[in-house]
Amino acid sequence: MDSFNYTTPDYGHYDDKDTLDLNTPVDKTSNTLRVPDILALVIFAVVFLVGVLGNALVVWVTAFEAKRTINAIWFLNLAVADFLSCLALPILFTSIVQHHHWPFGGAACSILPSLILLNMYASILLLATISADRFLLVFKPIWCQNFRGAGLAWIACAVAWGLALLLTIPSFLYRVVREEYFPPKVLCGVDYSHDKRRERAVAIVRLVLGFLWPLLTLTICYTFILLRTWSRRATRSTKTLKVVVAVVASFFIFWLPYQVTGIMMSFLEPSSPTFLLLKKLDSLCVSFAYINCCINPIIYVVAGQGFQGRLRKSLPSLLRNVLTEESVVRESKSFTRSTVDTMAQKTQAV
């Protein structure tokens, strides 16, 4: 990487013009941030505060219970994924403040922006695992009674994390720092060496494996679960339905703009007006996706308040009540209220 003596943070975004304007010096640049960037900064700040504190609390509550409570294992892993992603936020925040200048080096460029994708894959795979767990509890209770244990849950989580890491590798490998001549700025981004086919392949895989396929499978999964639980009259609780829908919907709602813009950009020429417009919205889409990293603790608290009535208990005990309630599997095919209510938790998360 060529050296860059970045002594002038007063270089803002330079909207280059094709018109000849002798009155505008070529090295005078606008110092104001764009509206999408300002919104992204606000979202990043809120997500960081809520995400770090909320997920730290979830980790603290679930860590003690993870040895004996399977639900706690699920929530613990989801919270760790979210917490890890939140750690990159101060760096991403700083970069946007500096008009996307990246003074943190090549290694940080490869690792930090890739954390949100690791979170996406880890979350969706963990949620798929959790959903499979919910499904088995409803449809294969005897199997669950015999085989459903903490050891198997940890193995499932390890597999989910391993696959998530594997799926994040393309993003990690193609991230590079590019030092632009003017305005003097180091940018961190993906570079497919003008290989559009490769870029499209990565975007399509991300859309299918990180969004469309999980959306389809989880929708089917929860349709079956809810139909069964309603038909068995295990509970008519609309709270359960609301929380399941909230948990599942949050992932897809907050990832939708990122996925749509990502797939569109992979099919557009980098110099086209639409591409440039989408690129200006990129930070906002990333920040919107980052809301996933702080929404889980909020859902847990809202769900806890719902289950407890008014918030009379302390936050940790409320969370403990929501996150560590173990599903009881009876030999009969009916399910306890406890089993069904646990579905309400972010375990199902997507």
Epitope: T8, Y11, L20, D21, Y181
Partner: antibody
Framework: QVQLKESGPGLVAPSQSLSITCTVS????????VDWVRQSPGKGLEWLGV???????NYNSALKSRLSISKDNSKSQVFLKMNSLQTDDAAMYYC?????????????WGQGTLVTVSV | DVVMTQTPLSLPVSLGDQASISCRSS???????????LHWYLQKPGQSPKLLIY???NRFSGVPDRFSGSGSGTHFTLKISRVEAEDLGIYFC?????????FGGGTKLEIK
Amino acid sequence: QVQLKESGPGLVAPSQSLSITCTVSGFSLTSYGVDWVRQSPGKGLEWLGVIWGVGSTNYNSALKSRLSISKDNSKSQVFLKMNSLQTDDAAMYYCASHYGYDGLGFAYWGQGTLVTVSV
Amino acid sequence: DVVMTQTPLSLPVSLGDQASISCRSSQSLVHSSGNTYLHWYLQKPGQSPKLLIYKVSNRFSGVPDRFSGSGSGTHFTLKISRVEAEDLGIYFCSQSTLVPPTFGGGTKLEIK
């Protein structure tokens, strides 16, 4: 009318320093960047560095450790200083500017000053 | 650094003929602003280079319209529709999207 003119020593002994001055007219150094480019038969055209209107500098990493660019806005002069010259630093040295348009190419060049490195 | 590769090295032409010079870059030259900072220069013997085309296809002031530039991303071309005697010299492509700005090795346009 935009003009740039380099003035330098012509002959420099190995391991000594090279100092070249570029005097500009027709535009203000506070508003526009000035770059340094050299040309030798062996290396072709090679960009050395730039000093922007606000005074910040940017260098070719291959030469950064022994290169410095500064300027005097009031005198409309830009200075190139290169330390520890070797024989392969012998070249025609140009200052150039992209005044007056937005293309970031070098629209205006000085006539160049030939630098020979020899005992 | 971005490597600029020019072909051919030498281009013998007859006056009035069309000439075409190719330039390839080792990386995409699309700037974050959406512009592509690829330029063409002509250097005549004993003179400093002169800017002909900037940002791929824009003629600099005073450059005749027989000069045209095209291309995108990593592949670029300079065309001279009817070569005149004053067009002879060495043509360089150059990029100033990324640091350091780099130049091609040059293409010598000469009379056949």
